[in-house]
Interface confidence: low
């Protein structure tokens, strides 16, 4: 028994041109729900065949209203999962069916009024207890984007989710043919049921309905003692109470059998039983096909020369990784320029640019002067996306449509008189100063020769402007 | 959202029983694994054990011979107990559940201090 | 059972610094089933990390874990003001599950 879950990340119209802009009608606001229905194997059965592995329904979204003028985000999802518990064993390969439907909102005869936006069906390997897989599927206009999982239910566990874990009953180690639980170790394997009058102390058995002895015992039912009660030869400990019957350490042991596996022992060895899709002494190599159709996001397959790698996806743009699953991070090589916001739209990346900026990529600095004056002889100085003007002497402000009064800043030192002057000011520097801003001291041997006022101003009137 | 609400005397004297019981509420107890960890004063985290739904248990084995776990799925509770307490047993006492990916604490208790004296 | 060393015992940095946070195994943890928990002064552990790598639900990414085997680290990118703190590991490869004795984050 387990449980497959689905968590829809996004819904939205897909890239390229005619990509609608909104998923309700002309009638009014809606909102979006999805089912998820599964199918066991890989087969191509009719859409109206039944679910027979499960379905569900996804609560409904939040009501969407249509912005036109409004680039087409991800449109509001419902929350949490869709989860689809399944009583039996996990099929490994099962056939996915999303629909996207839309319940409209306005006034509807007879209450709301449901469509089918957008369905997507996909045949898939899966093991249970395995990662997230992710997806991208287009459905039309529509393009769907999700994750998707088979847990078991505990006590269940495995890829098929038939093992069953129980306590431990001995202290040190698990019963005679049983394998420890992961993750805990003082969890056991419940065993199949064996066949009927099977010896519970010296038969074990690994599927159902059979019998298989332990050293030291024969028969149908293991209740013969063989011919050789001897241990020599056979690992693990011997006692006079326990002749043979309890298995030391052996090559199964920790399970080195990868991806869902299972461990057979053979003499001074192991042999692992691959699930479906993995082979190898360990089935550590993966048997996935082109006829598979691993590559996901439009990726091209091709058969791989690596024995290691019996297929190779060629991704489209945009897409990385061995099945093309992951997408690529345009905006990390910071494309847009001058502190433009990057936005990867999936068939195109978008620059949003700052004031003052346009171009693809906002490398085109505006005329941050056009149509902008400054009065009174000022000059427009573009930078940053914001004009600014330069002022003629005598001017300030954002536009120089205020006088300055350059004296009012006190510039000359130690002092000196300041006088106003159409080409800036003037400064009457006390004794012992000299320089434009009196701000050097004449030398012991040197005379102050500045004169106590420049020709044509008066001390005190700082606001003269001729 | 998943919350856990540890409750109990917050005082037990030496070779009595403390009894804990956690509240879970905002989700069924069904399913899932759930924990009692404590923190004696100024000290690490120490595991206690576990219970399944269905019952099943595993307590850490220095604890085993005085510790029981117990659930209680129809007042989606779960209990602890452990008896002949001394003074080492004074530690907050924290509820907690196990997660599906594995058996670390996704959710915690606020923790209740029990302190163990005469 | 395995136990859990966390280095170093105390950890003084200012905020804005990197730190990084030592868990050693006594034997191989399997399948980097190791865990690691925030506790702050009156409150309950907080999940961060688990799988040795994998963030918890809700937590920033300048946390991030590694290791394998019998040596795992937290690392803390760039340290923000709520950040400091007594931060545990934790296996869960074997029963009994045990934590280590704890890092304390303070403030330098």
């Known amino acids: 028994a387990g449980v497959f879950e689905l968590q829809i990340h996004s819904f939205g119209p897909g890239p390229g041109p005619g990509a609608p802009r909104s998923p309700c009608s002309a009638r009014g606001p809606c909102r979006l729900f999805f089912r998820v229905c599964l199918k066991p194997g890989l087969s191509e059965e009719a859409a109206e065949s039944p679910c027979a592995l499960g379905a569900a329904l996804s609560a409904r979204g939040p009501v969407y209203t249509e912005q036109p003028e409004a680039p087409a985000p991800d449109l509001p999802l419902p929350n949490g999962l869709l989860q689809v518990p399944f009583r039996d064993a996990w099929p490994g390969t099962f056939s996915l069916i999303i629909e996207t439907w839309r319940e409209e909102l306005g006034d509807q005869i007879g209450g709301p009024a449901w469509s089918l936006l957008a369905r997507v069906t996909r045949r898939r390997r899966l093991a249970a207890g395995g990662p997230w897989a992710r997806d991208i599927q287009r459905a039309g206009a529509w393009e769907l984007r999700f994750s998707y999982r088979a847990r078991c239910e505990l006590p269940a566990v495995g890829t098929a989710c038939t093992r069953l874990c129980r306590p431990r009953s001995a202290p040190s180690r698990c019963g005679p043919g049983l394998r420890p639980c992961a993750p805990l170790e003082d969890e056991c394997e419940a065993p199949p049921v064996c066949r009927a009058g099977c010896s519970l102390e010296h038969g074990f058995c690994e599927q159902p309905g059979e019998c298989r002895c332990l050293e030291g015992w024969t028969g149908p039912l293991c209740m013969v003692p063989a011919s050789t009660s001897s241990c020599l030869g056979l690992r693990g400990p011997s006692s006079a109470t326990t002749g043979c019957l309890v298995p030391g350490p052996g090559p199964c042991d920790g399970n080195p059998c990868a991806n869902g596996g299972s461990c057979s022992e053979t003499p001074g060895s192991f042999e692992c039983t691959c699930p479906r899709g993995f082979y190898g002494l360990r089935c550590e190599v993966s048997g996935v096909t082109c006829a598979d159709g691993p590559c996901f996001n439009g990726g091209l397959c091709v058969g791989g020369a690596d024995p290691d790698s019996a297929y190779i996806c060629h991704c489209p743009p945009g897409f990385q990784g061995s099945n093309c699953e992951k997408r690529v991070d345009r905006c990390s090589l910071q494309p847009c320029r001058n502190g433009g916001l990057c936005l990867d739209l999936g068939h195109a990346l978008r620059c949003r640019c700052r004031a003052g900026f346009a171009g693809p990529r906002c490398e085109h600095n505006l005329d941050d002067c056009a149509g902008r004056a400054c009065a009174n002889g000022g000059t427009c100085v573009e930078g940053g996306g914001a004009h600014r003007c330069s002022c003629a002497l005598g001017f300030g402000g954002r536009d120089c449509r205020e006088r300055a009064d350059p004296c009012a800043a006190r510039p000359c030192a130690h002092g000196g008189r300041c006088y106003a002057h159409f080409s800036g000011l003037v400064c009457a520097c006390a004794p012992g100063y000299m320089g434009s801003r009196c701000e050097f001291p004449v030398h012991p041997d040197g005379v102050s020769a500045l004169p106590a006022a420049p020709p044509g101003l008066r001390p005190g009137d700082p606001q003269r402007y001729l | 959202q998943v919350q856990l609400q540890e409750s109990g005397p917050g005082l037990v004297k030496p070779s009595e029983t403390l009894s804990l019981t956690c509240t879970v509420s905002g989700g069924s107890i069904s399913s899932y694994y759930w924990s009692w960890i404590r923190q004696p004063p100024g000290k690490g985290l120490e595991w206690i054990g576990y219970i399944y739904y269905s019952g099943r248990t595993n307590y850490y084995p220095s604890l085993k011979s005085r510790v029981t776990i117990s659930i209680d799925t129809s007042k989606n509770q779960f209990s602890l107990k452990l008896s002949s307490v001394t003074a080492a047993d004074t530690a907050v006492y924290y509820c907690?559940?196990?997660?599906?990916?594995?058996?670390?604490?996704?959710?915690w208790g606020q923790g209740t201090l029990v302190t163990v004296s005469s | 059972e395995i136990v859990l060393t966390q280095s170093p015992g105390t950890l003084s940095l200012s905020p804005g610094e990197r730190a990084t946070l030592s868990c050693r195994a006594s034997?191989?943890?399997?399948?980097?089933?190791l865990a690691w928990y925030q506790q702050k002064p009156g409150q309950a552990p907080r999940l961060l990390i688990y799988g040795a790598s994998s963030r918890a639900t809700g937590i920033p990414d300048r946390f991030s874990g590694s290791g394998s085997g019998t040596d795992f680290t937290l690392t803390i990118s760039r340290l923000e003001p709520e950040d400091f703190a007594v931060y545990y590991c934790q296996q869960y490869d074997r029963s009994p599950l045990t934590f280590g004795g704890g890092t304390k984050l303070e403030i330098k």
């Open positions: 907690a559940r196990i997660a599906v990916a594995g058996f670390f604490f996704d959710y």
């Open positions: 034997q191989s943890v399997n399948k980097n089933y």
